[in-house]
Interface confidence: low
């Protein structure tokens, strides 16, 4: 039986140019990670695996860097990074739990977070 | 089973045009950039590029820009590799490779290109 | 030609300790994991080391590798006939924004 819950930073806005954290967290199991996927609609970012650490696929590599902890820092925004962003924790012997970010990059200098919420 | 097969070997003339496959299959085709390597008769293995299935994003080996054209057809989990003018120097062994973490982890068989007139 | 450097050839006798050595710069080995290939005659080249140290399942704990600066080397123990094959390196270049191969180093077991 699955028990844990994802916890991540929700809907998130940031500034054209700027960087965001990408933040997911995995609690209330104790299941344990054996790696972390993180993608943006149908396409791989960066993956964290336990044994291996940290791959960012090659069309992020300039853009993306790796933490902190099993997060990831969106770096030089444009607005073409607005949309859905998932984390997916791969865990034995649980299975896969996946959390969801929505991202807004604005034109404007006014980019205020979201509220944290829970996706179980 | 994760295999890449690719399509069998040509001989074509001069001038010829040809594409030249790379079938993936027993994973997920979109999450893996796909590369191709050329290996010309008793030499070493260049690497010609990469591109990535999902949105057909290419990096391309200097050497090998605007030489070739490499492309995806995510519907099919297919990936190719094309020329529109062939040379005598482009005889050799083509092989396509998945990608995870760096290294080309899994590999086609090959498909040997062998141009003569 | 290769942006990694390697010795052409390589040989030992069954049972030794072989090494191949792998040369290149800040911009590759320098600041990215290196990568072995084994290509035995006639076939495919097969991933035999990555990320420096690791080996993919399969791969026998007689091959290793290590990495300083900017050279990397794969050492084979307990050497076999079946080790009788070209080996090369690889890693990401980030000057390129693609990998560079070495020129390969073939392997003779005497």
């Known amino acids: 039986m699955m028990t844990g819950t994802i916890e991540t930073t929700g809907n998130i806005s940031a500034e054209k140019g700027g960087s965001i954290i990408l933040q997911c967290h995995l609690s209330s199991t104790t299941a344990q990670v054996t790696q972390v996927n993180w993608e943006q609609q149908d396409q791989l970012l960066a993956i964290c695996n336990a044994d291996l650490g940290w791959h960012i696929s090659p069309s992020f590599k300039d853009r993306v860097a790796p933490g902190p902890g099993l997060g990831l820092t969106l770096q030089s925004l444009t607005v073409n990074d607005t949309g859905e962003y998932f984390c997916i924790y791969h865990t034995y012997p649980d299975g896969t739990y996946t959390g969801r970010i929505f991202l807004e990059v604005l034109e404007s200098s006014v980019a205020e977070h979201g509220a944290r919420f829970q996706i179980p | 089973e994760v295999q890449l097969v690719q399509s069998g070997a040509e001989v074509k003339k001069p001038g010829e045009s040809l594409k030249i496959s790379c079938k993936g299959s027993g994973y997920s085709f979109t999450n893996y950039w796909i590369g191709w390597v050329r290996q010309m008769p008793g030499k070493g293995l260049e690497w010609m590029g990469i591109?990535?299935?999902?949105?057909?994003?290419?990096i391309y080996s200097p050497s090998f820009q605007g030489q070739v054209t490499i492309s995806v057809d995510k519907s099919v989990t297919t990936a190719y590799l094309q020329w529109s003018s062939l040379k005598a120097s482009d005889t050799a062994m083509y092989y396509c490779?998945?990608?995870?973490?760096?290294?080309?982890?899994?590999w086609g068989r090959g498909t040997l290109v062998t141009v003569s007139s | 030609l290769p942006v990694l450097t390697q010795p052409p050839s390589a040989s030992g006798t069954p049972g030794q300790r072989v090494t191949i050595s792998c040369s290149g710069s800040s911009s590759n080995i320098g600041s990215n994991t290196v990568n072995w290939y084994q290509q035995l005659p006639g076939t495919a080249p097969k991933l035999l080391i990555y990320?420096?140290?690791q080996r993919p399942s399969g791969v026998p704990d007689r091959f290793s590798g290590s990495t300083s600066g900017t050279s990397a080397s794969l050492a084979i123990s307990g050497l076999q006939s079946e080790d009788e094959a070209d080996y090369y390196c690889?890693?990401?270049?980030?000057?390129?924004?693609?990998?560079?191969f070495g020129g390969g180093t073939k392997l003779t077991v005497l």
């Open positions: 690889e890693a990401w270049d980030d000057s390129l924004n693609g990998p560079v």
């Open positions: 490779a998945r990608y995870y973490y760096y290294a080309m982890e899994v």
């Open positions: 990320r420096n140290n």
């Open positions: 591109i990535n299935p999902v949105n057909s994003r290419t």
